[in-house]
């Protein structure tokens, strides 16, 4: 009669994560008479899986009636399979003996290998703000992974980018792997409404890449502009003076007048009008007395936006232009008109 | 193509330990058995002991207590540490790879390091 | 322990010429799945060891076919079909069958 051969089938497979491998062995012959075990791995430090005549093995099932007489499949099941898992089983033939068991021959073997899917890319942009024109890093992170290759992309707003570095760890072998990626975006004044979007191709996903976003609104600080201009006359002896700040994001604004030099007031932004591409912007009046003036007025507008270093921008008043009349109702203190409305929306 | 390659100090001290690093570079740490193995000057090649893929180590009775060979599969690496080092230990280290198809035994240490020597002096 | 033990410890040769070394284990290097767990290494001058020929008989990878390995049990030969002067240097038989691995104390090729 012939020897008895052990048949493994699947020189490979591939399990999903969570999901059960079922591992393939038949043999030819019910002679000679002795158990089937199952190894991970050969020599000597291989490691039992499943023992037909002894152990418990909870995760592992027969896929035949191995009580039956005439049974030649020893196929096994393993369930809930988790990338630890991966290698390679061997289906091995013992033939009966005293004390032990004799190994007799063993199959070729069959290489599991664990598929898990990255886990949701998470994307994080710069601990501070930058402003427009400066160039900023964004990271992506994925895990959990197996096997190890893997695609990433990066994209601002739909415009695929080019400028970034990526690492996938470990460099060895490993039961799953991370992806890490720092990608270099460069600010314009228009990315308030921007995203920037990691994107994770895997052979797990089926062609559905999972993705990660960042809103540029966490990231860029567009700084204002100023515009100081004098309104014409409101009263005879009142000149309206207004500031306008423009194109700022984000919101927080805070601003001052000065006379001279020396602080009038001060306002926090409300009531903001926004722009199309998602900046904002306010206007700020004051109404000057000018017959309390003897000499020209310096009038400062200074704007402290987001806990930036303040700017400012200035404008002459000419008393002279507005000649006193002796019969106004001019009472002695601050030289603004404290009654006139403080700020608007422009 | 897999290739293996030594690190570590040539000199060590009497009564030190000997520390030496095994990369592996262009192949995989699965499967394989990764092996440590001397040679000291003029004479044959002696077994100190491997590490298999998933953990478990194998030592020379004789070098057991003094030897401890470690797998860090996440930089494709293996090391070998031995205590208290006498002139008896100089020799060339290889590191090198041990392979196992099936059943219970080896099939040949095929690929090698180029060797490291190490000289136990004062 | 498994010991080895080659002979002849030297052996001088002739290019062109075929060459043979013996190795015996203590024990049988035989399985019981039928596969013998003997190596044969080379390791030439100044160089590391490498692999000829595993499980007995078969040539490892690259090895040119003027190496060839029998035997079976505890009684192993290899054997040089036409030396070349490549092919100096010491031969080594090891058994992989269980720990600790062992090797034999080498036979030193030299050309004549």
């Known amino acids: 009669e012939e020897e008895l051969q052990v048949i493994q089938p699947d020189k490979s497979i591939s399990v999903a994560a969570g999901e059960s491998a079922t591992l393939h062995c038949t043999v030819t012959s019910l002679i000679p008479v002795g158990p089937i075990q199952w190894f991970r791995g050969a020599g000597p430090g291989r490691e039992l899986i499943y023992n037909q005549k002894e152990g418990h093995f909870p995760r592992v099932t027969t896929v035949s009636d191995l009580t039956k007489r005439n049974n030649m499949d020893f196929s096994i099941r393993i369930s809930n399979i988790t990338p630890a898992d991966a290698g390679t089983y061997y289906c091995v033939k013992f033939r009966k003996g005293s004390p032990d068991h004799v190994e007799f021959k063993s199959g070729a073997g069959t290489e599991l290998s664990v598929r898990a899917k990255p886990s949701a890319p998470v994307v994080s942009g710069p601990a501070a703000r930058a402003t427009p024109q400066h160039t900023v890093s964004f990271t992506c992170e994925s895990h959990g992974f197996s096997p190890r290759d893997i695609t990433l992309k990066w994209f601002k707003n739909g415009n695929e980018l080019s400028d970034f570095q990526t690492n996938v760890d470990p460099a060895g072998d490993s039961v799953s792997y991370s992806i890490h990626s720092t990608a270099k975006v460069v600010l314009t004044r228009e990315d308030v409404h921007s995203q920037v979007i990691c994107e994770v191709a895997h052979v797990t996903l089926q062609g559905d890449p999972l993705r990660g976003t960042a809103n540029l609104s966490e990231t860029i600080r567009v700084p204002p502009t100023l515009e100081v201009t004098q309104q014409p006359v409101r009263a005879e002896n009142q000149v309206n003076v207004t500031c306008q700040v423009r194109k700022f994001y984000p919101q927080r604004l805070q601003l001052t007048w000065l006379e001279n030099g020396n602080v009038s007031r001060t306002e926090t932004a409300s009531t903001l009008t926004e722009n199309k591409d998602g900046t904002y912007n306010w206007m700020s009046w004051l109404l000057v007395n000018v017959s309390a003036h003897r000499d020209d007025v310096k009038l400062t507008c200074q704007v402290e936006h987001d806990g930036q270093p303040a700017v400012s921008k200035s404008h002459d008043l000419k008393v002279s232009a507005h000649p006193k009349e002796q019969g106004s109702n001019t009472a002695p203190g601050p030289a603004l008109a404290s009654a006139a409305p403080l700020g608007g929306s422009g | 193509q897999v290739q293996l390659q030594e690190s570590g100090p040539g000199l060590v001290k009497p009564s030190e330990t000997l520390s030496l690093t095994c990369t592996v570079s262009g192949g995989s740490i699965r499967d394989y058995y990764w092996s440590w193995i001397r040679q000291p000057p003029g004479k044959g090649l002696e077994w100190i002991g491997f590490i298999y893929y998933n953990g478990r180590t194998f030592y020379q009775s004789s070098l057991k207590s003094r030897v401890t060979i470690s797998l860090d599969t996440s930089k494709n690496q293996f090391s070998l540490k031995m205590t208290s080092v006498t002139a008896a230990d100089t020799a060339v280290y290889y590191c090198a790879r041990v392979r196992a198809y099936s059943g219970i035994g080896l099939d040949g240490t095929d690929v090698w390091g180029q060797g490291t020597t190490v000289t136990v002096s004062s | 322990d498994i010991v080895m033990t080659q002979s002849p410890l030297s052996l001088p040769v002739t290019p062109g010429e075929p060459a043979s070394i013996s190795c015996r284990s203590s024990?049988?290097?035989?399985?019981?799945?039928?596969?013998?767990?003997l190596d044969w290494y080379l390791q030439r001058p100044g160089q590391s060891p490498q692999l000829l020929i595993y499980g007995g008989s078969s040539r490892a990878s690259g090895v040119p076919d003027r190496f060839s390995g029998s035997g079976s049990g505890t009684d192993f030969t290899l054997k040089i079909s036409r030396v070349e002067a490549e092919d100096v240097g010491v031969f080594y038989c090891?058994?992989?069958?269980?720990?600790?691995?062992?090797f034999g104390q080498g036979t030193k090729v030299e050309i004549k």
């Open positions: 090891g058994q992989a069958l269980q720990t600790p691995l062992t």
């Open positions: 024990q049988s290097l035989l399985y019981s799945t039928g596969y013998t767990y």
